[in-house]
């Protein structure tokens, strides 16, 4: 058992048929030494009297809040969660594997520029009685400071016959140097709390590696003079990191119409501006990755042909 | 301990093609050992990120946009005295600043020549004939530090008596092309901003 | 699958003009750009020009601007390329490729010998 | 137009060998560099596009790497039916253009 908050405690069960348990020994936080008796939850029946209360811990029905009473006084509460492990791997009952980039990725992490800011989300078909707190560190052993903020619902999906539901939260690393060499990964701890079950998802990188530019802004066309050919110019997103010519951008420019099947025109180019084949009923999109290390690229920015 | 806005003419830096040879280089090398290792471990995620260039070179410091300088979690100087004889600029602007910056890309190319020409050294008397380094990668750091130009004191290659581990040996190659990888993209958005500059 | 087959091999005289067909088949003609690249013999692969069936859009290598048309028939999922005052220089293996991309050849035709000869 | 230069004009390798082919282009043409093979009397055959992109059905062995100015396509090991001569292209502007072909020859 273990402390997660003042008055929250976690126990940490071996979850299988006819499990021992875990042993609890709770305490009343009173100078009182007599006439003490403890409940559970809303419930009035009397579990023990006594300044200690000795429980034993097997399923959700052994958790929940403990209250010592004096008199018809509360002294104090404890609550009680329960962290599985089942064949020695703990839950992930809250959240969702995103199954992106990889099988067991529940949270995903991306930055739009080197800053040290980054926003990470996750998703639960979970609506109520869910808590969520965020910490977040540079490297494990010696940790440096990463601030995070609350995790908000960030958005509602209707996926087949259930709703998923999106939180998100955004971390400054306290100290960052955009050009900096990273050498330790940020870790992102999420502590999720659905009823009186705990559980802690993970998750580790390097800010490099989860860069993904803002769309080019600014799109702008020019047909050139008897050709079928337009220039197409845009400019890097404002929130990129500067200067530019330090932490450049590569860029993909990309003609197609509404379908991804139809055909397309498609060039690669370092600079802001390409020349293209514009079709009718096409659009003419733009995405940006860094040029010199490929994470990801960013979403497109689009404009239509005519 | 910064890099000034107003130096080389435009185009007429030949280290810009050189450092994007060299990204290329261990980007391509990099790929090849982590296909060929497969079963080491050799990803981003295994591996133990070292620098060997930590304590001796100040490179990313050194060469820091003038626009970074404001920027104090950028600052954490770690002064180094080099040599400030490089001529990759075919420009008599080189400044002081850019000379350092130049110099301590060179220190550390020199310093990861010697290692992976040890290296490949070893891995040549490996009987399972696993993997070696491309040739390419090492004459793209060679060329480039050419380019730079400077006059420094030749470190011996480090020759080692013991029987060589050659798990031990491809685990350091992974960790030594990922650390070099890092480097190169300093290396290339350096040469980047001082081409523009 | 995707296939174009082209016509067969002709022999011309200076001055006068080729016609080479290219018909596709497993594909809409509609849904790919047609292509044009020529090989001298014992030479390398030089570029002619596009056309985009959907709209008859072209654009032509600068070397062969008025004296190439491309054209299609929907209808019979054919393109034509006709090359006009042909010179000796113009003897080559002349090849349809077609593809969703623009600017790379995916699908290629067995290719057309045009032998230009007095 | 954007001239492409393939060198060597001519690679003798053994079989089983590997064999490293070169493409430059005067100025940074990105990515946009494809390579085709093509062997006698037969039309070209799309290799690799965008300068790294494998094409399925096209063995393993057949890579691709560079940006900018120089390109490689690289053959791990080489075996019979590889000797061809192979082109690359560029597709950055009007006129597509095409290097002068590598030779890949047995030694």
């Known amino acids: 058992i273990w402390e997660l908050k003042k008055d929250v405690y976690v126990v940490e069960l071996d979850w299988y048929p006819d499990a021992p348990g875990e042993m609890v020994v709770l305490t009343c936080d009173t100078p009182e030494e007599d006439g003490i008796t403890w409940t559970l939850d809303q419930s009035s029946e009397v579990l023990g009297s006594g300044k200690t209360l000795t429980i034993q811990v097997k399923e959700f029905g052994d958790a929940g809040q403990y209250t010592c009473h004096k008199g018809g006084e509360v002294l104090s509460h404890s609550l009680l969660l329960l962290h599985k492990k089942e064949d020695g791997i703990w839950s992930t009952d809250i959240l969702k594997d995103q199954k992106e980039p990889k099988n067991k990725t529940f949270l995903r992490c991306e930055a739009k520029n080197y800053s040290g800011r980054f926003t990470c989300w996750w998703l639960t078909t979970i609506s109520t009685d869910l808590t969520f707190s965020v910490k977040s560190s540079r490297g494990s052993s010696d940790p440096q400071g990463v601030t995070c903020g609350a995790a908000t619902l960030s958005a509602e999906r209707v996926r087949g016959d259930n709703k998923e539901y999106e939180y998100s939260v955004e971390c400054q690393e306290d100290s960052a140097c955009p050009a900096a060499e990273e050498s330790l990964p940020i870790e992102v701890m999420v502590d999720a709390v659905h009823k009186l079950k705990y559980e802690n998802y993970t998750s580790s990188f390097f800010i490099r590696d989860i860069i993904k530019p803002d769309p080019p802004k600014n799109l702008q066309l020019k047909p050139l003079k008897n050709s079928r050919q337009v220039e197409v110019s845009w400019e890097y997103p404002d929130t990129w990191s500067t200067p530019h010519s330090y932490f450049s951008l590569t860029f993909c420019v990309q003609v197609q119409g509404k379908s991804k099947r139809e055909k397309k025109d498609r060039v690669f180019t370092d600079k802001t501006s390409a020349t293209v084949i514009c079709r009718k009923n096409a659009s003419i999109s733009v995405r940006a990755q860094d040029r010199y290390y490929s994470s990801s690229w960013s979403e497109w920015a689009s404009v239509p042909c005519s | 301990r910064n890099l000034p806005v107003a130096t080389p003419d435009p185009g007429m830096f030949p280290c810009l093609h050189h450092s994007q040879n060299l990204l290329r280089a261990v980007s391509n090398m990099l790929q090849k050992a982590r296909q060929t290792l497969e079963f080491y471990p050799c990803t981003s995620e295994e591996i133990d990120h070292e620098d060997i260039t930590k304590d001796k070179t100040s490179t990313v410091e050194a060469c820091l946009p003038l626009e970074l300088t404001k920027n104090e979690s950028c600052l954490n100087s770690r002064e180094t005295s080099f040599i400030t004889n490089g001529s990759c600029l075919a420009s008599r602007k080189t400044s002081f600043m850019m000379a350092l910056c130049l110099s301590s890309i060179y220190e550390d190319l020199k310093m990861y020549q010697v290692e992976f020409k040890t290296m490949n050294a070893k891995l040549l008397m490996d009987p399972k004939r696993q993997i070696f380094l491309d040739q390419n990668m090492l004459a793209v750091i060679d060329e480039l530090m050419q380019a730079l130009n400077f006059n420094s004191e030749t470190v011996p290659q480090k020759s080692s008596l013991e029987e060589p581990d050659f798990y031990k040996t491809k685990i350091k190659l992974c960790i030594l092309l990922h650390a070099f990888r890092i480097r190169a993209v300093t290396i290339d958005r350096v040469m980047s901003y001082l081409n523009a500059s | 699958q995707v296939q174009l087959v082209q016509s067969g091999a002709e022999v011309k005289k200076p001055g006068a003009s080729v016609k080479v067909s290219c018909k596709a088949s497993?594909?809409?003609?509609?849904?790919?750009?047609l292509h044009w690249v020529r090989q001298a013999p014992g030479q390398g692969l030089e570029w002619m020009g596009w056309?985009?069936?959907?709209?008859?859009?072209?654009e032509y290598a600068p070397k062969f601007q008025g004296r190439v048309t491309m054209t299609t028939d929907t209808s019979t999922s054919t393109a034509y390329m006709e090359l006009r005052s042909l010179r000796s220089d113009d003897t080559a293996v002349y090849y349809c490729?077609?593809?969703?991309?623009?600017?790379?050849?995916?699908?290629w035709g067995q290719g057309t010998m045009v032998t230009v000869s007095s | 137009e954007i001239v492409m230069t393939q060198s060597p004009a001519t690679l003798s390798v053994s079989p089983g060998e590997r064999a490293t082919l070169s493409c430059r282009a005067p100025q940074s043409i990105s990515i946009n560099l494809h390579w085709y093979q093509q062997k006698p009397g037969q039309a070209p055959r799309l290799l690799i596009y965008f300068a790294s992109q494998s094409i399925s059905g096209i063995p393993a062995r057949f890579s691709g790497s560079g940006s900018g100015t120089e390109f490689t396509l690289t053959i791990s090991s080489l075996q019979s039916e590889d000797f061809a001569v192979y082109y690359c292209?560029?597709?950055?502007?009007?006129?597509?253009?095409f290097g002068g072909g590598t030779k890949v020859e047995i030694k």
């Open positions: 056309i985009d069936p959907e709209n008859g859009d072209t």
């Open positions: 292209q560029q597709s950055n502007s009007f006129p597509l253009t």
């Open positions: 497993g594909y809409t003609l509609t849904d790919y750009y």
């Open positions: 490729n077609a593809n969703k991309e623009l600017r790379y050849f995916d699908v």
